[in-house]
């Protein structure tokens, strides 16, 4: 006899990276007929939802109207059908951004390079942090972690046109509290001797749509829960 139900899926909308004082919804999808969902935060019960009518609902949404550092961390959810509880979902890392300061991102030898050249990004932040994150806009899996007292370097090695795109960096005060994003740096790679038509360019956004990027970059992953444990989340573990 089955002692537990299958684990639910958990994800954040519009994004797991949430600017402080902004809203986020944590979604938990279980089974039709579930009479109660529980959202747990860092091992403690955070919220409860009892869908009505349960037989017609297989997903609940927990709304956080005002993100802050106290709510940044790891979430999981469970659900109950009758007296039988599910396995816990995978962990969702919820990150608060726009904390404290703004780092500076630079690139060497420059933003316009030839394919095959070695490129290094430098992220600098003069406040108390030793961990830095470099994100390539367009795909949340393009996240690198670096360390340094006030600056971290991110060597990309010999680049190809696949490295083209817009980059930003964050300083990380802990795994779940990040700085404001840096200003964007757009890397242009030209002269690839390979077939450049086979090297798709990530979608990039002008600087003023970074907010929109944060709201949309997870969308594809959230629609396919099997992909939810993606690199950006795993990087936080």
């Amino acid at each position: 006899q089955q002692q537990t139900l299958p684990k639910p899926f958990i994800w954040a909308e519009p994004h797991f990276m949430v600017p402080k004082e902004k809203q986020v919804t944590i979604c938990c999808q279980g089974n039709y007929g579930a009479v109660e969902y529980q959202l747990h935060f860092e091992g403690s019960l955070f919220a409860v939802d009892r869908p009505k009518p349960p037989e017609r609902i297989n997903k609940v949404q927990f709304y956080i109207p005002d993100m802050n550092s106290r709510m940044a961390g790891q979430y999981s959810c469970i659900y109950r059908v009758g007296e039988l509880w599910s396995e816990p979902s995978n962990l969702l890392d919820l990150v608060v951004t726009e904390m404290y300061d703004t780092p500076t991102l630079s690139v060497h030898p420059g933003p316009e390079v030839i394919s095959g050249e070695k490129v290094t990004f430098y992220c600098r932040l003069d406040t108390a942090t030793s961990m830095f994150l470099l994100l390539k806009e367009g795909r949340s899996s393009h996240v690198q972690r670096g360390y340094g007292k006030v600056q971290a370097e991110f060597p990309l090695g010999p680049v190809t046109t696949a490295h083209r795109g817009t980059y930003r960096c964050f300083g990380s005060y802990n795994n779940h509290a990040w700085s404001f994003p840096s200003e964007p740096v757009k890397l242009l790679v030209t002269g690839d001797i390979e077939n450049t038509s086979l090297a798709p360019e990530d979608p990039t956004f002008p600087a003023d749509t970074w907010g929109t990027y944060l709201l949309t970059t997870e969308t594809g992953l959230q629609k396919d829960h099997a992909l939810w444990d993606h690199t950006a989340q795993n990087l936080l573990r």
């Epitope: 919220a47 409860v48 109207p65 709510m71």
Partner: nanobody
């Protein structure tokens, strides 16, 4: 901006009853999930009871069957009816709100709440 004002605290004997009230200012009360927390001297603030916009409730194990949370949207007020009071119920009781939220969300963790009252003292002693 939401302001919360608690009332109804006082001194009561063990086994007695009290009803706490929390009056909320503003027109956002109907879109708020509400909760009661308490803090005893020298202890951390702990969850007592919560109620969703749609009147779903959740209680701490220690008060289940003794305390009842309810709300009156017409009066912008949430209540905590406390009966069979014990010495260990002695604490400052705080009302809190999550504004806005979805209809059936019940919040248990204090970090979720974005508005707090100043508290009212409940003392249970012979």
């Amino acid at each position: 901006e939401v302001q919360l004002v608690e009332s109804g605290g006082g001194e009561v004997q063990p086994g007695g009853s009290l009803r706490l009230s929390c009056a909320a200012s503003g027109r956002t009360f109907a879109s708020a999930a509400m909760g009661w927390f308490r803090q005893a001297p020298g202890k951390e603030r702990e969850f007592v009871a919560a109620i969703s916009r749609s009147d779903d409730t959740y209680y701490a194990e220690s008060v289940k069957g003794r305390f009842t949370i309810s709300r009156d949207n017409a009066k912008n007020t949430v209540y905590l009816q406390m009966s069979s009071l014990r010495a260990e119920d002695t604490a400052v009781y705080y009302c809190a709100a999550v504004v806005p939220t979805y209809g059936s969300n019940i919040y248990v963790h204090s970090a979720a709440y974005n508005y707090w009252g100043q508290g009212t003292l409940v003392t249970v002693k012979p």
